[in-house]
Structures are given as C-alpha cells and as structure tokens.
C-alpha cells in the first residue's frame, strides 16, 4: 500500500518556499494566510536576539525511562507554538560553477524557487507534525531494514558538502515501507542548530528538536535518483529526531569523532562501515508518514517521509560536536542547516499508531480528527 496521492485542489492556496523572501507568485500564501513558522521573515527583518525567546521559554520535556530513555513524540506537551525564533542562518551554501542547483544557501539570496522551481511547490517538506491531527493507519506496518549492519571494510565516505555532513552508503541496504514498497538506502545526513538553538527540520506541535537524521532511499522501481525525482514514492526518507541524553551514543560517536577531519567545506574522509540501523530509533513500528519533498534544492516532491515517533539520544557533548565542528563556505560555521516548516496544504499526516489519543483523565473518548486514507489498501 502507498500513501495516497495528494489532491491538487487542496484547501489552502499554494506552497511556501521556506525561504526568507516571500515569493511573488499568486498561489503562494500571503503574510496573513501563513503562520510565521511557515513563512519566515526576510533577512532584513529577522528579529534581533532580544526578541527571541530563550531556552527557558521553550516547553521543558523530560524523557521517559522506557525505550532506551527516548522521548516519545506524543509525550510532548501540546502547546501553541509561537513563531519559531531559530531561523536558519545565512551561512551554508555550495557554490560550484556550472551547477545551478549548487548555488543555494540557508537563508537569504537566491530564493530557492529561483534555484529550483519545485521549491515553490504546494507539498513541500519539512512540516510541523501535530499528533492530534494525524490519521491512525493500522495498515502502516513496522518498517523492515535489511543489510544495514555493515562490516568495517570497505570503508564509507563521510563528507562535508557545505550544507550538511553526509555518509554515502554502499549498495545492498534494503528498506521496505510495506509490501511492494521497497527501497535501497543511498546516503544519510544530519541537520542541526547551534549552541542553545535546536536545528531539527521537522517539528512536533511547534517544538524543534536539537537535530535530525535523514536516511535517503531510492525506490527499487527506479534505476537512478534523476529518474525518481518528482515521481510519487520515487524517494523515501527515514527521519529521526536527535536529542540530549545522559550518555554518549556509541553508534554516533563513530561518525562524530571524525568530524574534525572534515571541518573544511568540501572535505571528506573514509570511515569504517558501521551498523547504520544503530543510528535510528529501535522502535520501527511507531512512526508518522506523509508525502512531501526534498528539504533542499531541487526540492523535488513525491518523497515519502517516515518520521519515527521514538527519538535518538546523544550526549550534550556529542550534540555540541555536531553543531560546532564543521565549516561552510568562507569563514562561516555550518550551523542551523534546516529549512523552515512548510504548509501542509491539505495533506494529512498518517500515523502507524494512535498518536492522537488523549490519555488525560478528562478525555472520555479518543479524539482522532482525520481518518486513514489508505486503510483499504
């Protein structure tokens, strides 16, 4: 079964580029149509530091002791999210001559739709996940991963590409979203913030996590990325939130310990193969799923996003290493490399578990506002 195709006549009027400058196209939301989170201010009108809420203003969330101490997304307090202060900095871009889709950066010019028109699409990523509005889909079975435990040799390329750190994966890592929905893993990369500023791409009820891992997959129905771009289900990304825990994460340390070697933009090193599945949460049965896009140019749509409910814990030192080691172009740090959340424009996020059930004593009946569109598949 596959996520249903998004309707072209969705109730909201158009998509947001997620960039600093609002677009002039008629079908894009105006300031009053779009919450601040989804329509970040331009570079020239970014709020000053004194306007930004501090860490103490963010909802405090304590992890549960179960499941490796990982926080569950549905355990987050339901708060009305103010405009997200952690806007991506104007500091991470690649600038390779002759490669139009390399001429982009987080924040500022050029507007992404000028780099790739798909970035102005109506069904973009990332998005804000609201568990209460997610449609419970019993048909969404536990994810299946095969071949993700790699031997030390051959080694893998770990690269600072100027907008993230990317680990290129070898052939043979197979992932299934369900029967007949088979993929092979291509690469993984991370998104992060800066000191005291979270940097996940997806948010939950407006809450941004310290960091986020993306494992990018190509459908076995397609030979190449170029052929899969923009095709429904052609690409699939497994996403998990990273947050602070008391202990060092040994799986992540195998990568984080090598970041100093690739501090410079465009540099790379070889790292021993590792258990890629150890970088993900252990619970493959509870997740959110929706159809969106790549979160960087070319912003191609049709990407199936699977966001784990369980998070991954890294130590404070590890999160600091992630956000404070790499450099982008020039003399700028590679930080805050996340895109602003994009409007759903009528899309329904599906959940493999009853995420919208309110367990508080006041709730007489579980509340589920959206029904699963794929239940009959």
């Amino acid at each position: 079964q596959r996520l249903p195709r998004m309707q072209e006549d969705s109730p909201l009027g158009g998509g947001s580029s997620g960039e600093d400058d609002p677009l002039g196209e008629e079908d894009l939301p105006s300031e009053e149509d779009s919450p601040r989170e989804e329509d970040p201010p331009g570079e020239e009108d970014l709020p000053g530091e004194e306007d930004l809420p501090g860490e103490e203003d963010l909802p405090e969330v304590k992890p549960k002791s179960e499941e490796e101490g990982s926080l569950k997304l549905e355990d987050l307090p339901t708060v009305e999210a103010p405009g997200d202060p952690q806007e991506p900095q104007n500091n991470a871009h690649r600038d390779k001559e002759g490669d139009d889709q390399s001429h982009w950066r987080y924040g500022g010019d050029p507007p992404w739709p000028r780099v790739s028109p798909a970035c102005a699409g109506r069904f973009q990523s990332p998005v804000d996940i609201r568990p209460q509005l997610a449609a419970f889909c019993p048909a969404l079975r536990p994810l299946e991963l095969l071949g993700f435990q790699l031997p030390p040799l051959p080694e893998l390329r770990l690269r600072n590409n100027g907008h993230s750190v990317q680990l290129t994966l070898p052939p043979g890592l197979e992932m299934a979203l369900g029967p007949g929905r088979e993929y092979r893993a291509l690469q993984l990369h991370l998104h992060w913030g800066a000191a005291g500023r979270p940097g996940s791409e997806h948010t939950v009820e407006g809450h941004r996590f310290p960091a986020e891992i993306h494992v990018v997959h190509l459908s076995t129905a397609f030979a190449r990325v170029d052929e899969a771009l923009g095709r429904p289900g052609g690409l699939a990304v497994l996403a998990a939130f990273l947050e602070e825990g008391p202990e060092e994460n040994s799986a992540y340390e195998q990568l984080l310990s090598r970041l100093e070697e690739i501090a410079e933009e465009g540099s790379e090193t070889q790292v021993p193969g590792l258990d890629i599945s150890a970088l993900l949460p252990s619970d493959f049965s509870r997740y959110f799923q929706y159809e969106g896009s790549l979160t960087t140019p070319p912003c191609a749509q049709g990407v199936i996003w699977t966001v784990f409910n369980q998070t991954v814990m890294l130590s404070a030192k590890q999160l600091h290493t992630l956000s404070d080691t790499l450099w982008g172009p020039g003399d700028s740090r590679l930080q805050l490399n996340f895109r602003a959340t994009q409007p759903l424009n009528g899309r329904v996020i599906e959940a493999s578990f009853p995420a919208g059930v309110d367990s508080s004593p006041r709730a007489a009946e579980p509340v589920q506002l959206n029904s699963c569109l794929a239940a009959g598949d």
């Epitope: 002759g98 390329r157 190449r224 170029d226």
Partner: antibody
Framework: EVQLVESGGGLVQPGGSLRLSCAAS????????LIWVRQAPGKGLEWVSI???????YYADSVKGRFTISRDNAKNSLYLQMNSLRAEDTAVYYC????????????????????WGQGTLVTVSS | DIQMTQSPSSLSASVGDRVTITCQAS??????LSWYQQKPGKAPKLLIY???KLASGVPSRFSGSGSGTDFTLTISSLQCEDFATYYC?????????????FGGGTKVEIK
C-alpha cells in the same frame, strides 16, 4: 549531438608526463559523473579514474598517486594528468559520461556510461 | 576493492544461437551493473544499464538480468553484427578508490 572527444595522447618516455583532455559538446558536463577507462593493446577495459559532480576524484590502485583527474566546467572539459608514466600505462584512453545527471549528494551511483569518446593512444616507450 | 569475474573469456557460436555471458561481483552491487559491446578499433558501446534495462537504440535480442552479485547478459538470437567482445562494469562505490571494475571480457567469435 552529445559527444566526447579525447586529445593529448602521444609518445612519451618512461617517467614522463602527459595531459589528456576530453571535450564535451551537446551537453554541460558539470552535473555528470565522468570516467576515464583505458585499454592496453590486445587487452580488456580497465577503469582508471572517476570524478563525481562535486569534483571528488577516485582512482584505481594502479594509477593512484600518479594520475589526477579534473574538470573545467567553464571549458566543458575533463582532464587526466598522467605523471611518472610507465610502460604498462601504454593504452588507448577513453573518457565516458554517466548516462543520466548525477546526484552524488544523494548517494547516487552510475549504472551505465554513455556516450564514450573515440579514444586517444598513449605510448610510453624509450 | 571490487572484482568482477566474467565468463567465459571466449565462445564460438553461430548466427541464430542463444548466447549467455555471466558476470560475478566480489560483493553486492545491487543493480549497478552495465554491459558493453566493443568491436576492434572502436569505443565501447552501452548495451544494458542498471543490470537489466536496455540502452536506447539497442536491439531487443539483448537482455540483462541479475542483482546483487550474479549477472547475466543474453543474446537471444545471435546476428552477424553481434560478433564482438562484451564487457561488464560493476560499480560498488564512486566514493572510494577502486570502487568500480570491469570484467575480463568475453570474445564472441563465429563458429
């Protein structure tokens, strides 16, 4: 017409250097993974070097440290700088292009090379 | 390092024969395998990409199959113009040295 044309081959003494060029026409090579392949007289094809669209370069063990692959997107050309040449480097050298646009930032791998150049002969002999 | 083992190294066949050439990778390469035809004095020509997909302009008598480590090129009914040398190319990685390799080649001769 999409085309690759190699040049720069010739006779060189052992220990000498040579720079091969591969000029592209009919397409912009900047977004493609490119490869150099060689074929010694009467022998099979041997992969020499590859460069992805981020200009990361990789080599066969037999040429590592002696050969350097590079590209000039403005000139729409691929190069192979060959130093410390040996008799066993004598071969026809071909350049070839990944058949579709490369997305190496997405871990994309080439699954076929097309088109190919006509080849240029390098002879290393004293 | 990846190695590609191609067999047979040569074969004799007649027009109309069905010809099968195999290639084995030393480690799984999924479907990142291509087949090439080369005639004397000419550059290689792409026949099959992604293990089983026919390149543009290639006759349908050519087909490829396999995934992982074992691959096959089949010519269902050999024609005069098919007498040539055939090579497989496997790609395990382009982000490490020695991440790609050709098979040793199969020379298809007239019986």
């Amino acid at each position: 017409e999409v085309q690759l044309v190699e040049s720069g081959g010739g006779l060189v003494q052992p220990g000498g250097s040579l720079r091969l060029s591969c000029a592209a026409s009919g397409f912009s090579l900047s977004r493609y993974t490119l490869i150099w392949v060689r074929q010694a007289p009467g022998k099979g094809l041997e992969w020499v070097s590859i460069i992805d669209s981020s200009s990361s370069a990789y080599y066969a063990d037999s040429v590592k440290g002696r050969f350097t692959i590079s590209r000039d997107n403005a000139k729409n050309s691929l190069y192979l700088q060959m130093n410390s040449l040996r008799a066993e480097d004598t071969a026809v050298y071909y350049c070839a292009r990944d058949r579709v646009l490369s997305y190496d930032d997405y871990g994309d791998l080439p699954d076929g090379f097309d088109p190919w150049g006509q080849g240029t002969l390098v002879t290393v002999s004293s | 390092d990846i190695q590609m083992t191609q067999s047979p190294s040569s074969l004799s066949a007649s027009v109309g024969d069905r010809v099968t050439i195999t290639c084995q990778a030393s480690q799984s390469i999924s479907n990142y395998l291509s087949w090439y035809q080369q005639k004397p004095g000419k550059a290689p020509k792409l026949l099959i990409y992604a293990a089983s997909k026919l390149a543009s302009g290639v006759p349908s008598r050519f087909s490829g199959s396999g995934s992982g480590t074992d691959f096959t090129l089949t010519i269902s009914s050999l024609q005069c113009e098919d007498f040539a040398t055939y090579y497989c190319l496997g790609v395990y990685s382009i982000s490490t040295d020695d991440g790609a390799a050709f098979g040793g080649g199969t020379k298809v001769e007239i019986k």
